[in-house]
């Protein structure tokens, strides 16, 4: 297709000059452009008391182009609209209005919500999560050995974050009690001693019901060595308490 377009030329005025500026096809010294070259829009510009014809490559903001056989005109968008393809198809609304299907609305229709960033009415988006991933190995304080009760965790991903009015996401982490596989810990695999063995607080995302109580995790089947460790721990705890009490009385 060729870029050139046919336009019926307007009848020549007595004061029409041949050396037209810019995109003018015909013009006069007094009125400026009288007609435009193909693909250009004719608009009137007010200069003082006088209106001058100008030819524009595109219509200014707030106006849209209309084609006629002999002229292309710029026409104003509706009052509530900043940019448009025509009066019935707005593409950007003025401040305080929301765009929906080419119209500018004060409030969004039922079932839609206002996006204050894009100033559009958008569909309410509900949270979507993936299927659960497999359960993690059963561990007790990071160890997968030692004939103890432990915990296992599984996670799932958020596929679609919800919009402001959408349904919130369900938990994405789940932890439950389990039995650590029955095998003796190798050297260096034993649990840490003393205060270091205190359980880390669970993450916010973990479901309460699935978070195990540290007491209930203690297994009745213990190796003598581990029982000794426990007694030492108890002693240390008592000592620690006494220390903290004595410290607190200083204040």
């Amino acid at each position: 297709q060729n870029a050139s377009r046919g336009r019926r030329q307007r009848r020549m005025h007595p004061n029409v000059s041949q050396g037209c500026q810019g995109g003018c096809a015909t013009c006069s010294d007094y009125n400026g452009c009288l007609s435009c070259k193909p693909r250009l829009f004719f608009a009137l510009e007010r200069i003082g008391m006088k209106q001058i014809g100008v030819c524009l490559s595109s219509c200014p903001s707030g106006y849209y182009g209309t084609r006629y056989p002999d002229i292309n005109k710029c026409t104003k968008c509706k009052a509530d609209c900043d940019t448009c393809f025509n009066k019935n198809f707005c593409t950007k609304c003025k401040s305080g209005f929301y765009l929906h299907l080419g119209k500018c609305l004060d409030n969004c229709p039922e079932g839609l919500e206002a996006n204050n960033h894009t100033m559009e009415c958008v569909s309410i988006v509900h949270c979507e999560v993936s299927e659960w991933n497999p359960w993690s190995p059963c561990t007790k304080k990071g160890k997968t050995c030692g004939f103890k009760r432990g915990t296992e965790t599984r996670v799932r991903e958020i596929i679609q974050h919800p919009s402001a009015k959408g349904n919130l996401c369900p938990p994405t982490n789940e932890t439950r009690k389990c039995t650590v596989q029955r095998k003796k810990c190798q050297k260096g695999e034993r649990g840490k001693k003393g205060r270091e063995r205190k359980r880390k607080k669970p993450n916010k995302g973990e479901s309460k019901e699935a978070i195990p109580d540290s007491k209930s995790l203690e297994s009745s089947k213990e190796i003598p060595e581990q029982r000794e460790n426990k007694q030492q721990q108890k002693k240390r705890k008592v000592q620690d308490k006494q220390k903290s009490v004595s410290v607190s009385t200083v204040h």
Epitope: S58, G65, F89, G102
Partner: antibody, heavy 117, light 111 residues
Framework: QVQLVQSGAEVKKPGASVKVSCKAS????????IHWVRQAPGQGLEWIGY????????GYNQKFKNRVTMTRDTSTSTAYMELSRLRSEDTAVYYC??????????WGQGTTLTVSS | DIVLTQSPASLAVSLGQRATITCKAS??????????MNWYQQKPGQPPKLLIY???NLESGIPARFSGSGSGTDFTLTINPVEAEDVATYYC?????????FGAGTKLELK
């Protein structure tokens, strides 16, 4: 002479994304909005949406709203249309077109997209 | 959405005869005295080509045997006389409202 030259044919698997380009020449790229229209095999024409190259503002047919993104690069006078989460029904010829005073007056040659597993 | 119903779906016309294609909109596509209806011609393997804009205006470079008429909801594309090169599919398209929509097309063949 106004010309819109589109990128070559694409074959994609369901769930994947595709990005089609449309390079404009012969006019000032920022003067007119660029629209995208598709045509499934043996079917009619379906409007996808538009972009204003001057400021990057875009608008989409509600049907495609959550899957389509239109962008542009004014330095190369190129418009892009990205369609995500592809399904077999997206198999079609995708056209870009300039929109001049409420009609599509210049069209790209089309980009064939085949979505198949 | 504005639905455009084209009829007939296909049409066989003898060379030199008149071909008439109609397009009915589900609601008016007029505003401020302008009709936002366009007609396109598409040949196999090619993009569509603008024939008529604003219901009745002939696009530059298009032969005068093509003409458009109508307003509101009822529009007509006429080809008179039909020539061999006119074998194609013809689409009406409204640009009055979002989303822009096309008719399903009318396939013109020679008898």
């Amino acid at each position: 002479q106004v010309q819109l030259v589109q990128s070559g044919a694409e074959v994609k698997k369901p769930g994947a994304s595709v990005k089609v380009s449309c390079k404009a020449s012969g006019y000032t790229f920022t003067d007119y909005s660029i629209h995208w229209v598709r045509q499934a095999p043996g079917q009619g024409l379906e409007w996808i949406g538009y972009i204003y190259p001057s400021n990057g503002d875009s608008g989409y047919n509600q049907k495609f709203k959550n899957r389509v993104t239109m962008t542009r690069d004014t330095s190369t006078s190129t418009a892009y249309m990205e369609l995500s989460r592809l399904r077999s029904e997206d198999t079609a010829v995708y056209y870009c077109a300039t929109y001049f005073a409420n009609n599509f007056d210049y069209w790209g040659q089309g980009t064939t997209l085949t979505v198949s597993s | 959405d504005i639905v455009l119903t084209q009829s007939p779906a296909s049409l066989a016309v003898s060379l030199g005869q008149r071909a008439t294609i109609t397009c009915k909109a589900s609601q008016s596509v007029d505003y401020d005295g302008d009709s936002y209806m366009n007609w396109y011609q598409q040949k196999p393997g090619q993009p569509p080509k603008l024939l008529i804009y604003a219901a009745s205006n002939l696009e530059s470079g298009i032969p005068a045997r093509f003409s458009g008429s109508g307003s509101g909801t009822d529009f007509t594309l006429t080809i008179n006389p039909v020539e061999a090169e006119d074998v194609a599919t013809y689409y009406c398209q409204q640009s009055n409202e979002d989303p822009l929509t096309f008719g399903a097309g009318t396939k013109l063949e020679l008898k």
